[in-house]
C-alpha cells in the first residue's frame, strides 16, 4: 500500500501532502547501505547505523533490510520509492510508523524486510510476531 | 570530507530579517536536495523548507511567505531568507544534503 498521501508534480517532482493538504517533507532515514550486523534471535534491533539522511524525493520512505546465510548477517537501511520494487518485492508496508519485518523468500538465505513512512523510523527494526498484527487496540497497548 | 557549515545566524528584534547561508565543500550542492530544518529550544527538530534539484522548494506552512531558499550554484551555497520573524522562530537552523551530511548548525534568536 502506497502512504495515503496526495501526491502532484511540479517541475517533475512529486509535490506530497497529507490528508489535511499540509505539505510533507521528505522523509529522514538511516541510510547506511549494507553492513556487517550482530542483530539475531531478537524480538527488535537498532540499526547502530549514525548517518541520519533525508531522502531525496518527497515520496520516499524508510526501508531495512536483514539477511543472513551461512557466512554472515548484515542490515540494509536505505530511502526507497515505494512505487518501485526494492529487491524485487514491493514496499507492502510503506505506510507504516514502525519498521515492522517479513519474511520474504529468498534462496539461499533468510531474507527480511519492512519499510515505514516516519522519521528515522529504520532504526529500530522490529521482528517480533506480536507486533504483526492489524488490531489497533493491541497496536496501542504495545507501542504505550 | 564533505563539509556543510551554517552562518548568518544573530539575534534579531521580531518582524526583523536574517539570511542564513550554506556553504558546502566536498559535495556539488547544485546535484543534491537541500533541507534547512531547525531545533527550538527544548523541542524535535522540523522541517523548515526543502529545495530539489530541479528548483522546486516546499515550505512548512509556519513558515511560508516569510522564508525563501536559493541557491548561487558558482558559490555552491544554499541560503535561507528569513523576513518578518517572530519569536517562534528561534532555534538552531540547519542545512542539510543527501546522503547524510549535516551542518553544525547556526543559532537564530528572535527577541
Known amino acids: 500500500t502506497i502512504p495515503p498521501h496526495v501526491q502532484k508534480s511540479v517541475n517533475n517532482d512529486m509535490i506530497v501532502t497529507d490528508n489535511n493538504g499540509a505539505v510533507k517533507f521528505p522523509q529522514l532515514c538511516k541510510f547506511c547501505d549494507v553492513r556487517f550486523s550482530t542483530c539475531d534471535n531478537q524480538k527488535s534491533c537498532m540499526s547502530n547505523c549514525s548517518i541520519t539522511s533525508i531522502c531525496e524525493k518527497p515520496q520516499e520512505v524508510c526501508v531495512a533490510v536483514w539477511r543472513k546465510n551461512d557466512e554472515n548477517i548484515t542490515l540494509e537501511t536505505v530511502c526507497h520509492d515505494p512505487k518501485l520494487p526494492y529487491h524485487d518485492f514491493i514496499l507492502e508496508d510503506a505506510a507504516s510508523p514502525k519498521c515492522i519485518m517479513k519474511e520474504k523468500k529468498k534462496p539461499g538465505e533468510t531474507f527480511f524486510m519492512c519499510s515505514c513512512s516516519s522519521d528515522e523510523c529504520n532504526d529500530n527494526i522490529i521482528f517480533s510476531e506480536e507486533y504483526n498484527t492489524s488490531n489497533p487496540d493491541l497496536l496501542l497497548v504495545i507501542f504505550q | 570530507q564533505v563539509q556543510l557549515q551554517e552562518s548568518g545566524g544573530g539575534l534579531v528584534q521580531p518582524g526583523g530579517s536574517l539570511r542564513l547561508s550554506c556553504a558546502a565543500s566536498?559535495?556539488?550542492?547544485?546535484?543534491?536536495?537541500v533541507a534547512w530544518y531547525r531545533q527550538p529550544p527544548g523541542q524535535q527538530r522540523e522541517g523548515v523548507a526543502h529545495?530539489?534539484?530541479?528548483?522546486?522548494?516546499i515550505y512548512a506552512d509556519s513558515v511560508k511567505g516569510r522564508f525563501t531558499v536559493s541557491r548561487d550554484n558558482a558559490k555552491n551555497t544554499v541560503y535561507l531568507e528569513m523576513n518578518s520573524l517572530k519569536p517562534e522562530d528561534t532555534a538552531v537552523y540547519y542545512c542539510?544534503?543527501?546522503?547524510?551530511?549535516w551542518g553544525q548548525g547556526t543559532q537564530v534568536t528572535v527577541s
Open positions: 566536498g559535495i556539488i550542492l547544485s546535484s543534491k536536495a
Open positions: 542539510t544534503a543527501p546522503v547524510g551530511h
Open positions: 529545495s530539489s534539484v530541479s528548483g522546486t522548494t
